[in-house]
C-alpha cells in the first residue's frame, strides 16, 4: 500500500532511502528540454520474489526539440502524491543494499534524467535523515522515519532530529576543549526514553548518522 504523505520535513535536514521496498515507484522524469520517449514508461517499479528484487521498466528521455510537444513533466498517477528525496552527502553510503531482502537498490541514473527524483513510497519504507552542510545534530544516533499503517491510515514516524547552525565557540579563555564524541538524545539503557523505539538500526551506516534524542518512537 502506498504511503499517503511525504516523509516529514525536518528543518536544515535532508532524507534518503538506503534501499526501496518492493512496490515503490520512481517517476520517469526528464530534465528541462527533454521528455519521456513516446510509449516510454511512466515509472520504474521495484518488484521481486523471495530471493531477488529489481526495478521493472526503464526510464528513457529524448530531446523535446525533436517533437512538437514540449511537455517535460511526467503526469502523476491519480491520487498519488509526490515523494521527493534529496541526495544526501557522503559519508552516508550504506552497507550493501542488496543484503536487504524485498528491497531494491538505488536505481542507476538514466540519460538526461531530472535533477530531483520523485518516489512513491510504500508502507514499511524507512528513510534516514542527516543535517545539511553547515548544521550539526544535537544528539547522536540514526534519525529515521518509517511509513506505518495505523487504523487504516498511513503515517510517517517523526524523526525528531534537531540540526543547529553556526556553532558558538568557547566564550571564556582557558575553557576546556570539548570531548570529541557524538551527540544525540538519551536512550535508556534499561528502559527506552520517550521516543526511543526505532533507535537501533542494524547497519553500519545508521550507526554513523547523527540524530536527536527524539529519534525514536514509543512502542
Amino acid at each position: 500500500e502506498l504511503c499517503d504523505d511525504d516523509p516529514p520535513e525536518i528543518p536544515h535536514a535532508t532524507f534518503k532511502a538506503m534501499a526501496y521496498k518492493e512496490g515503490t515507484m520512481l517517476n520517469c522524469e526528464c530534465k528541462r528540454g527533454f521528455r519521456r520517449i513516446k510509449s516510454g514508461s511512466l515509472y520504474m517499479l521495484c518488484t521481486g520474489n523471495s530471493s531477488h528484487s529489481s526495478w521493472d521498466n526503464q526510464c528513457q528521455c529524448t530531446s523535446s526539440a525533436t517533437r512538437n510537444t514540449t511537455k517535460q513533466v511526467t503526469p502523476q498517477p491519480e491520487e498519488q502524491k509526490e515523494r521527493k528525496t534529496t541526495e544526501m552527502q557522503s559519508p552516508m553510503q550504506p552497507v550493501d543494499q542488496a543484503s536487504l531482502p524485498g528491497h531494491c537498490r538505488e536505481p542507476p541514473p538514466w540519460e538526461n534524467e531530472a535533477t530531483e527524483r520523485i518516489y512513491h513510497f510504500v508502507v514499511g519504507q524507512m528513510v534516514y535523515y542527516q543535517c545539511v552542510q553547515g548544521y550539526r545534530a544535537l544528539h547522536r544516533g540514526p534519525a529515521e522515519s518509517v511509513c506505518k499503517m495505523t487504523h487504516g491510515k498511513t503515517r510517517w514516524t517523526q524523526p525528531q532530529l534537531i540540526c543547529t547552525g553556526e556553532m558558538e565557540t568557547s566564550q571564556f579563555p582557558g575553557e576546556e576543549k570539548p570531548q570529541a564524541s557524538p551527540e544525540g538524545r538519551p536512550e535508556s539503557e534499561t528502559s527506552c526514553l520517550v521516543t526511543t523505539t526505532d533507535f537501533q538500526i542494524q547497519t553500519e551506516m545508521a550507526a554513523t548518522m547523527e540524530t536527536s534524542i527524539f529519534t525514536t518512537e514509543y512502542q
Epitope: 525536518i10 528543518p11 547522536r140 534537531i162 534524542i213
Partner: antibody
C-alpha cells in the same frame, strides 16, 4: 530507569559563583544533547543553555551569555553549569534535562541575595 | 516575555474538554519544528506530556492530544479530571535562539 540528579545549588551573594552538577543514569548519556532550564519562583520555564552530545558546541540564552558556562563529562555521565557574576534575577530552581527535553531532574534551588 | 504565547489560565469542570493554545513564529513552530507539551504539577518538575506535536509518551492517557498547524499548536484534554489541575507549557526549538523556547504556561483549574 532514567534519572537526573542536580546538586550544587544554594545561597550566594550577588556577583558570586556557583557550579551546578547533574548526574545522569539509566540511559546512554553520551548520545544526547543536554539542557539547563530554570524556573524563578512563581514564574514559567526559561531555557538557559544546551550542549551537544559530544560537547562540541554550546548555546546560551541572552540573559546568561558571557556569565554561565555549560560543560559535560561523558566519562562520568555528568553535566555541569558554571555560574559566575550571579544576579538577583538568576534566583530560580535549575533543572537539568535530557533530549527534547523529555526527561527532567527534580531541580536545585539557587538563591542570589545579599 | 515568552517567545511562545499561551493563555495564562484555563478552566473546566470534570468530564469537560478543554483546549490550550500555543502561538509561535516563523523561527520556531512555523519553521517546521515539533511542538512538545509539559505538565507541571504543583511542587514538582515538568513532565513530558506530548512530543512531536501529537505523540504521547508511554503512560500518558489518550485523553491528552496535541495538534499543530502553521505557527501555532494546541493541547486538548478531554474527560477532564481533578488530577489534571496543573501548569501546562508548550515548547519548540527556535532557530534564532539555537535552543528550545517555552510558552509562558497555562494554569489549568478544574472547577
Amino acid at each position: 530507569e532514567v534519572q537526573l540528579l542536580e546538586s550544587g545549588g544554594g545561597l550566594v551573594q550577588p556577583g558570586g559563583s556557583l557550579r551546578l552538577s547533574c548526574a545522569a543514569s539509566g540511559f546512554t548519556f553520551s548520545s544526547y544533547g543536554m539542557h539547563w532550564v530554570r524556573q524563578a519562583p512563581g514564574k514559567g520555564l526559561e531555557w538557559v543553555s544546551v550542549i551537544s552530545y559530544d560537547g562540541s558546541y554550546k548555546y546560551y540564552a541572552d540573559s546568561v551569555k558571557g556569565r554561565f558556562t555549560i560543560s559535560r563529562d561523558n566519562s562520568k555521565n555528568t553535566l555541569y553549569l558554571q555560574m559566575n557574576s550571579l544576579r538577583a534575577e538568576d534566583t530560580a530552581v535549575y533543572y537539568c534535562a535530557a533530549g527534547v527535553p523529555d526527561y527532567w531532574g527534580q531541580g536545585t534551588l539557587v538563591t542570589v541575595s545579599s | 516575555q515568552s517567545v511562545l504565547t499561551q493563555p495564562p489560565s484555563a478552566s473546566g469542570t470534570p468530564g469537560q474538554r478543554v483546549t490550550i493554545s500555543c502561538t509561535g513564529s516563523s523561527s520556531n513552530i512555523g519553521a517546521g519544528y515539533d511542538v512538545h507539551w509539559y505538565q507541571q504539577l504543583p511542587g514538582t518538575a515538568p513532565k513530558l506530556l506530548i512530543y512531536s506535536n501529537n505523540e504521547r509518551p508511554e503512560g500518558v492517557p489518550d485523553r491528552f492530544s496535541g495538534s499543530k498547524s502553521g505557527t501555532s499548536a494546541s493541547l486538548a484534554i478531554s474527560g477532564l479530571r481533578s488530577e489534571d489541575e496543573a501548569d501546562y507549557y508548550c515548547a519548540a526549538w527556535d532557530d534564532s535562539l539555537n535552543g528550545p523556547v517555552f510558552g509562558g504556561g497555562t494554569k489549568l483549574t478544574v472547577l
